[in-house]
C-alpha cells in the first residue's frame, strides 16, 4: 500500500496497536527506541482498542487508511515524489 | 515522511477534545457507524491516559517521525 | 464549551401559537444536528424534532406534524421550535438538544442539553 | 414506533450498591442505545451510547451492555450523586424513543 511508503514505521505501530496484539507493539516500538514510559502509554491506547473489540479496530483502520489515501496525503506524496525527481535530476 | 493529515489526526487524538477530533474524522468518514466509535476510543484513551502518558505518546510519535525509518 | 440557552417559553391558551428560540454557542454550530426534545410535569422525556446541520432535513414526532415547525439560521448559530395550534398535552419543558455526532451523524443522540424552557398551553 | 421499556420503573438502593437497570426494545435496535442520567429540575445527561461507549467524564462504574432488544446499564458501586431517573433511548430510526425511566432512590 502507497501510503506505508510514506512513513512505514508509523503504520506498524498504528496497526500494532489496533490489531491488540502486545508482542508486535513491543517489536515495533523497539525499532525506535521507545523508552518504558513510552511504551505503557501506547499499551494505554491498545487497551482501548482490545476494549472496544474487533468492529472498533477495523472502524478505525478504515478512517486512517481513508485519511492515508484522501487527497490531502496523496497530493503530498505526489509533491514530494516530484520535489524527490528534481533533486534526482540536478543530482546527475 | 508522514502526511500533515494523519499527523494531525494523531495529535488530536491524544490532545484535543472528543467533538475536535471527531469533527476531523468527520471530513474522511462522515459515517455514524465510524464517528461513534471514534469518539467511543478518544472518551476512553481520555479517561485512561494521564498528562503524562499522553506526553510520552507524544515523545514516542516525535521519534517515529524523525525515524530513518519513517 | 457547549452552551445552549432556551428562550421563548411561557403560559398560553389553547389553539395559540408561541416560538422558542435556542442559542447555541461554544461548538462548531453548522456541523450539527439540532433537536428539541421535551418533558411533561413528572413525566418521561419524549423527542419532538430534528433538523439536520445544514438544515436540509426535517423530522417530527407523530403528534406535532403539520403544528410544529423547527428551523434554524446558522449564521446566528440559532434554533428555532414555532409552535402552532398548541393543546394542553403540550404542556412541558422543552429542551434544546445537540447531537453527539457531526454532519451525517445527526444520528439522534443528544450529546448536550440546555435547560429548558416551560410552556405551559392552558385557559 | 419502537417502544422501549424499563424496569424497575423504580429501585432502592445503598451507597456502594452494585445496581442494574434492564432496557427493552419491541423490535431489534441493533446496538443503537443511549442512557442518560437526570436529576430533578436539571436537563439529561447522556451517559453511554451505542449501547456500551462511555461518555467523555462519566465515570467508569457505569457500563452498558447489550444488543438487538436487550440491554442493561450497570453501575457497579453506588456513589450519592447516582442517585437520580435514568432513561434509555432508541436512535434505531428517525423517530428516536425513550424508556419510561427508572428513579433510583435511597433505600
Known amino acids: 500500500v502507497k501510503m506505508a511508503e510514506t512513513c512505514p514505521i508509523f503504520y506498524d505501530v498504528f496497526f500494532a496497536v489496533a490489531n491488540g496484539n502486545e508482542l508486535l507493539l513491543d517489536l515495533s516500538l523497539t525499532k525506535v527506541n521507545a523508552t518504558e514510559p513510552e511504551r505503557t502509554a501506547m499499551k494505554k491506547i491498545q487497551d482501548c482498542y482490545v476494549e472496544n473489540g474487533l468492529i472498533s479496530r477495523v472502524l478505525d483502520g478504515l478512517v486512517m487508511t481513508t485519511i492515508s489515501s484522501s487527497k490531502d496525503c496523496m497530493g503530498e506524496a505526489v509533491q514530494n515524489t516530484v520535489e524527490d525527481l528534481k533533486l534526482n535530476t540536478l543530482g546527475r | 515522511e508522514i502526511c500533515p493529515a494523519v499527523k494531525r489526526d494523531v495529535d488530536l487524538f491524544l490532545t484535543g477534545t472528543p467533538d475536535e477530533y471527531v469533527e476531523q474524522v468527520a471530513q474522511y468518514k462522515a459515517l455514524p457507524v465510524v464517528l461513534e466509535n471514534a469518539r467511543i476510543l478518544k472518551n476512553c484513551v481520555d479517561a485512561k491516559m494521564t498528562e503524562e502518558d499522553k506526553e510520552n505518546a507524544l515523545s514516542l510519535l516525535d521519534k517515529i517521525y524523525t525515524s530513518p525509518l519513517c | 464549551q457547549v452552551v445552549l440557552v432556551e428562550s421563548g417559553g411561557g403560559v398560553v391558551q389553547p389553539g395559540r401559537s408561541l416560538r422558542l428560540s435556542c442559542a447555541a454557542s461554544?461548538?462548531?454550530?453548522?456541523?450539527?444536528?439540532m433537536h428539541w426534545v421535551r418533558q411533561a410535569p413528572g413525566k418521561g422525556l419524549e423527542w419532538v424534532a430534528v433538523?439536520?446541520?445544514?438544515?436540509?432535513?426535517?423530522y417530527y414526532v407523530d403528534s406535532v406534524k403539520g403544528r410544529f415547525t423547527i428551523s434554524r439560521d446558522n449564521s446566528n448559530n440559532t434554533i428555532y421550535l414555532q409552535m402552532n395550534s398548541l393543546r394542553a398535552e403540550d404542556t412541558a419543558v422543552y429542551y434544546c438538544?445537540?447531537?453527539?455526532?457531526?454532519?451525517?451523524?445527526?444520528?439522534?443522540?443528544?450529546?448536550?442539553w440546555g435547560q429548558g424552557t416551560l410552556v405551559t398551553v392552558s385557559s | 414506533d419502537i417502544q422501549m421499556t424499563q424496569s424497575p420503573s423504580t429501585l432502592s438502593a445503598s451507597v456502594g450498591d452494585r445496581v442494574t437497570i434492564t432496557c427493552r426494545a419491541s423490535q431489534s435496535v441493533s446496538s443503537w442505545l443511549a442512557w442518560y442520567q437526570q436529576k430533578p429540575g436539571k436537563a439529561p445527561k447522556l451517559l453511554i451510547f451505542k449501547a456500551s461507549g462511555l461518555e467523555s467524564g462519566v465515570p467508569f462504574r457505569f457500563s452498558g451492555s447489550g444488543s438487538g432488544t436487550e440491554f442493561t446499564l450497570t453501575i457497579s458501586s453506588l456513589q450519592p450523586d447516582d442517585f437520580a431517573t435514568y432513561y434509555c433511548?432508541?436512535?434505531?430510526?428517525?423517530?428516536?424513543?425513550f424508556g419510561q425511566g427508572t428513579k433510583v432512590e435511597i433505600k
Open positions: 438538544a445537540r447531537s453527539l455526532i457531526p454532519v451525517a451523524g445527526t444520528d439522534p443522540i443528544f450529546g448536550y
Open positions: 433511548q432508541q436512535y434505531n430510526t428517525y423517530s428516536p424513543t
Open positions: 433538523i439536520w446541520y445544514d438544515g436540509s432535513n426535517k
Open positions: 461554544g461548538f462548531t454550530f453548522s456541523s450539527y444536528g
